[in-house]
Amino acid sequence: EEELQVIQPDKSVLVAAGETATLRCTATSLIPVGPIQWFRGAGPGRELIYNQKEGHFPRVTTVSDLTKRNNMDFSIRIGNITPADAGTYYCVKFRKGSPDDVEFKSGAGTELSVRAKPSAPVVSGPAARATPQHTVSFTCESHGFSPRDITLKWFKNGNELSDFQTNVDPVGESVSYSIHSTAKVVLTREDVHSQVICEVAHVTLQGDPLRGTANLSETIRVPPTLEVTQQPVRAENQVNVTCQVRKFYPQRLQLTWLENGNVSRTETASTVTENKDGTYNWMSWLLVNVSAHRDDVKLTCQVEHDGQPAVSKSHDLKVSAHPKEQGSNTAAENTGSNERNIY
């Protein structure tokens, strides 16, 4: 028993960020005379939150009218709570002293914990595109949440991924926390329409997790397959040769025709057709005037896709009196670096 007790009935209070925290405090006596002050923390570095005697505390309101006669309720409300407000709050009775007021009795303290929602997860992929069968890393980041407990999952097209590593920082006590996760994803040729999803679940989200997405269309490069074929004669002394460029992504592609190694024509893919899997097909044709050639003609379709080293396919055109349709059975010639060395 004491002549004056400061009672803080709540050991802890949990408040969502943006809301108002109510910190309760009553005194059992008004004697001795002196103000109540609220502090965050204890010891010499404590922070003054409210002083009944003087000062301007715009975020703080008193629950009771402290000018009301013989009021012994010194509870306060703190508005617009942020994670930075977390800590232990002490209601402290001072007594008049000479010359300064003297700390007389402190409440046991109320720990204010702030529930703060995580920010929307941001998923980012590799800086450069990669081809199917390669493994790429995606990162997911979310910030500003509290308490520290959080769950993060990765999905690819609805299927949960297991190859990922997650860190929550800082390790020790903090007003708010951040999560960082890196997932490894193996690309397939069908991934143009695929999505990678990072899903974050936290107590503040009430069972409705936040999601961040990345489209693999931003990450994948599907190299084209080439097929050069000779079409039936269109006119006397003319042969139509087509180059089928199939299953490529992204669309950025430049094709060059070579006749016996000399550039005949260069064009950029424009009117492409899209496949169900999101890849593109394109066809280019070359009209060859056979009479202009005495010898056999080697036609090469050379494709530079998405800034990568060129790949090519050739077709030998036999010069004869009656040209007939010929299929292409020659092997592709790689005129640049190996097409797999692309990143």
């Epitope: 004697i31 005379v33 008049k96």
Partner: antibody, heavy 114, light 111 residues
Framework: QVQLQESGPGLVKPSQTLSLTCTVS????????VNWIRQPPGKGLEWIGI???????DYNSALKSRVTISKDTSKNQVFLKLSSVTAADTAVYYC????????WGQGTTVTVSS | DIVLTQSPASLAVSPGQRATITCRAS??????????MHWYQQKPGQPPKPLIY???NLESGVPARFSGSGSGTDFTLTINPVEANDAANYYC?????????FGGGTKVEIK
């Protein structure tokens, strides 16, 4: 129940130091302050000072240079020392609990005389 | 120092009548929404007995015949109705400012 009892010599010579003891029961001296008050014969009450639960003290400025209040919590005792006494210090001396002065001792009479 | 002036210095009241004692402070004894003025009753050979604290609050065990009022500098102790054993000296006291001070006292006699 709460009790306070003053004790000390009933007669003190002028210029000497008056020493009184207040022995308390029913409450803790760490939780409550104790006042000293005096009342000269046929006159009103005069507050001398208080020792708080944390052992800090406040004194009547008119007596501050001569008065010391201390305590021995383990013995439940509060002490008053008043130095350089004169006949004007003749009074009944009371101890009373807390800032509220809700419990009083019966008082002890101190006469200053040679 | 805050000087407390009580009036009257003495009064004689018949049983069943009302007795009113005033206490005027040289400066306000109000702080933080309360008046730090208290009243005591003292009978001969006895220590003072608390009656009223914080201007108007009755101490436990004190009959409801006693009441206190006032704020700032002017305070009143009322005994209604007066009984024979109310004969005593009555003191006001402030502990709003150091040094804590008492009024000079009012002697109540029963006719």
């Amino acid at each position: 129940q709460v009790q306070l009892q003053e004790s000390g010599p009933g007669l003190v010579k002028p210029s000497q130091t008056l020493s009184l003891t207040c022995t308390v029961s029913g409450f803790s001296l760490t939780g409550y302050g104790v006042n000293w008050i005096r009342q000269p014969p046929g006159k009103g009450l005069e507050w001398i000072g208080i020792i708080w639960g944390d052992a800090s003290t406040d004194y009547n400025s008119a007596l501050k240079s001569r008065v010391t209040i201390s305590k021995d919590t383990s013995k439940n005792q509060v002490f008053l020392k008043l130095s350089s006494v004169t006949a004007a210090d003749t009074a009944v001396y009371y101890c009373a609990r807390a800032g509220k002065m809700d419990y009083w001792g019966q008082g002890t009479t101190v006469t200053v005389s040679s | 120092d805050i000087v407390l002036t009580q009036s009257p210095a003495s009064l004689a009241v018949s049983p069943g009548q009302r007795a009113t004692i005033t206490c005027r402070a040289s400066e306000s004894v109000d702080s933080y929404g309360s008046s730090f003025m208290h009243w005591y009753q003292q009978k001969p050979g006895q220590p003072p007995k608390p009656l009223i604290y914080l201007a108007s609050n009755l101490e436990s065990g004190v009959p409801a015949r006693f009441s206190g009022s006032g704020s700032g500098t002017d305070f009143t102790l009322t005994i209604n109705p007066v009984e024979a054993n109310d004969a005593a000296n009555y003191y006001c006291q402030q502990n709003n400012e150091y040094p804590w001070t008492f009024g000079g006292g009012t002697k109540v006699e029963i006719k």
